[in-house]
């Protein structure tokens, strides 16, 4: 039995350019899209993803002393070089001389659970999203973003931290997942692949997208990141897939045009403030949501993931710039900085729209739709 397909509700249709580009058969995972040994699969494969800043990590005009016990950028594990069998490359961040932090890398030693035991947790991220198994949850209202349109001044810090490119956000960017679920944006960063190889962290029915943006938020119930780590709903990440489109994305160009300045691992530059919401899809009402973890050590759980149904379009040149400009330590490229998808282990992914109404060839047999856990909210 096949469920009727509703074109306008097709999961992950169309980029924020406004085109209707639902995942069609050509988007089904191919052999190349399936995890392979050289793709960063497996538990050890997290990128140095969430270089989560605490309040102290927001852009400072001058250095200031850190509060005792507060979580600093440097307090989180850093990434050491992965390798790709085809070419020397890496998505890596080497600790500064004298640092005694854990090192970790994609697809190699040490195993991530040894770096942080939480990486062996049962509710990890990223995951494969299967829209037909998602629970339609009408209680999931459109996301609300406030203060995301930043003026050009003050400038923002854009940094190659060795495992991603990260933009530190100033105070005042507020996001609500719903009533009483309020957050403050801290930073955003990207995940990408390499030439001809997609690099999103989340996948949709096994399909990996070219790249993915993460905007990391701290719950207003917590003053600092270290207090929120591991607490349910303490952190929230907005995630969107980046796809190839016909035109240059002017919002992304404001960041991508600056990557050459930070090609070297550990380097940073200042960029004019911009409209952060323009980096996200325009449709804030259609998304998938589940509880997971940071996708890098410390892999803390309790993170609320919101993955937009709509994708963002970048030109082929822009996607190439993203995947081919930055370097990790030594002579290794910063590429393929994504963690393999993790098992759901019984978790239900909720959808803010009826994503399961779909009769694609992927649903050849009857599917048991999950019910919305928050239906009574």
């Amino acid at each position: 039995q096949r469920l009727p397909r509703m074109q306008e509700d097709s999961p992950l249709g169309g980029g924020s350019s406004g085109e209707d580009d639902p995942l069609g058969e050509e988007d089904l995972p191919s052999e190349e899209d399936s995890p392979r040994e050289e793709d960063p699969p497996g538990e050890e494969d997290l990128p140095g993803e969430e270089d989560l800043p605490g309040e102290e990590d927001l852009p400072e005009v001058k250095p200031k002393s850190e509060e005792e016990g507060s979580l600093k950028l440097e307090d989180l594990p850093t990434v050491e070089a992965p390798g790709d069998p085809q070419e020397p490359q890496n998505n890596a961040h080497r600790d500064k001389e004298g640092d005694d932090q854990s090192h970790w890398r994609y697809g190699g030693d040490p195993p991530w659970p040894r770096v942080s035991p939480a990486c062996a947790g049962r509710f990890q991220s990223p995951v494969d999203i299967r829209p037909q198994l998602a629970a339609f949850c009408p209680a999931l209202r459109p996301l609300e973003l406030l203060g995301f349109q930043l003026p050009p001044l003050p400038e923002l810090r854009l940094r190659n931290n060795g495992h991603s490119v990260q933009l530190t956000l100033p105070p005042g960017l507020e996001m609500a997942l719903g009533p009483g679920r309020e957050y403050r944006a801290l930073q955003l960063h990207l995940h990408w692949g390499a030439a001809g190889r997609p690099g999103s962290e989340h996948t949709v029915e096994g399909h990996r997208f070219p790249a993915e943006i993460h905007v990391v938020h701290l719950s207003t119930a917590f003053a600092r990141v270290d207090e929120a780590l591991g607490r349910p709903g303490g952190l929230a990440v907005l995630a969107a897939f980046l796809e190839e489109g016909p035109e240059e994305n002017s919002a992304y160009e404001q960041l991508l045009s600056r990557l050459e300045e930070i090609a070297e691992e550990g380097s940073e530059t200042q960029v004019p403030g911009l409209d952060i919401s323009a980096l996200l899809p325009s449709d804030f009402s259609r998304y998938f949501q589940y509880e997971g973890s940071l996708t890098t050590p410390p892999c803390a759980q309790g993170v609320i993931w919101t993955v937009f149904n709509q994708t963002v379009m970048l030109s082929a040149k822009q996607l190439h710039t993203l995947s081919d400009t930055l370097w990790g330590p030594g002579d290794s490229r910063l590429q393929l900085n994504f963690r393999a998808t993790q098992p759901l282990n019984g978790r239900v992914i909720e959808a803010s729209f009826p994503a399961g109404v779909d009769s694609s060839p992927r649903a050849a047999e009857p599917v048991q739709l999950n019910s919305c856990l928050a239906a009574g909210d």
């Epitope: 050009p152 001044l153 200042q270 409209d275």
Partner: antibody, heavy 124, light 107 residues
Framework: EVQLVESGGGLVQPGGSLRLSCAAS????????MHWVRQAPGKGLEWVAF??????????QYSASVKGRFTISRDDSKNSLYLQMNSLKIEDTAVYYC???????????????WGQGTTVTVSS | DIQMTQSPSSLSASVGDRVTINCHVS??????LSWYQQKPGEAPKLLIY???NLHTGVPSRFSGSGSGTGFTLTIRSLQPEDYATYYC?????????FGQGTKLEIK
């Protein structure tokens, strides 16, 4: 009175060098980003470079047309801005203006105080 | 780079006329646009910042409007001292770019 006074312009051969100076007065120089903007004879305005204030690390930014050839610098103790111009080309011929830009309290870069300009002529 | 296109390139008007100059921007710059006036042999002067804010000391006959990609400078009642060249400039991101200028001449 808020004032910017440029000096150092002149005639130079292609490939040569020149150093422009700008003396600022009447405002807290250290607070501001400072720019150089130029205007070729009979043409429009072209932004050349800026240098951030102390709070933002004094880091510079250049237009593509001068990057690698020109160097902007400042000396807050002397309330002075400089533009070192090397490998000069005929197309660098212009009036060069010292301009005050944004600062910590600004929302964006607008150029609210301009010097009178100094003329640079690159010719063989 | 963000491209700025002013129209018209030149115009003739009489004292007392209402004059409008347009500036089209190649991408959305919100309200981060300024207008400048330059007279021959002088440095430019800031008239309007943030699309519509009048700079200190600028006569109230000057006004600015617009946001996104389209902006307008209006001179309500032209005065003899207003004959000059006018430039728009984006302050969204560097390289900062100016329009090519609009020369306002006496009719």
């Amino acid at each position: 009175e808020v004032q910017l006074v440029e000096s150092g312009g002149g005639l130079v051969q292609p490939g040569g060098s020149l150093r422009l100076s700008c003396a600022a007065s009447g405002f807290t120089f250290t607070d501001y980003y400072m720019h150089w903007v130029r205007q070729a004879p009979g043409k429009g305005l072209e932004w050349v470079a800026f240098i951030r204030n102390k709070a933002s690390g004094y880091t510079p930014q250049y237009s593509a047309s001068v990057k690698g050839r020109f160097t902007i610098s400042r000396d807050d103790s002397k309330n002075s801005l400089y533009l070192q111009m090397n490998s000069l080309k005929i197309e660098d011929t212009a009036v060069y203006y010292c301009v005050r830009g944004g600062h910590a309290g600004s929302n964006y870069w607008y150029f609210d105080v301009w010097g009178q300009g100094t003329t640079v002529t690159v010719s063989s | 780079d963000i491209q700025m296109t002013q129209s018209p390139s030149s115009l003739s008007a009489s004292v007392g006329d209402r004059v409008t100059i347009n500036c089209h921007v190649s991408q959305n710059i919100n309200v981060w646009l300024s207008w400048y006036q330059q007279k021959p042999g002088e440095a430019p002067k800031l008239l309007i910042y943030q699309a519509s804010n009048l700079h200190t000391g600028v006569p109230s006959r000057f006004s600015g409007s617009g946001s996104g990609t389209g902006f307008t400078l209006t001179i309500r009642s032209l005065q003899p001292e207003d004959y000059a060249t006018y430039y728009c400039q984006q302050g969204q991101s560097y390289p900062f770019t100016f329009g090519q200028g609009t020369k306002l001449e006496i009719k």
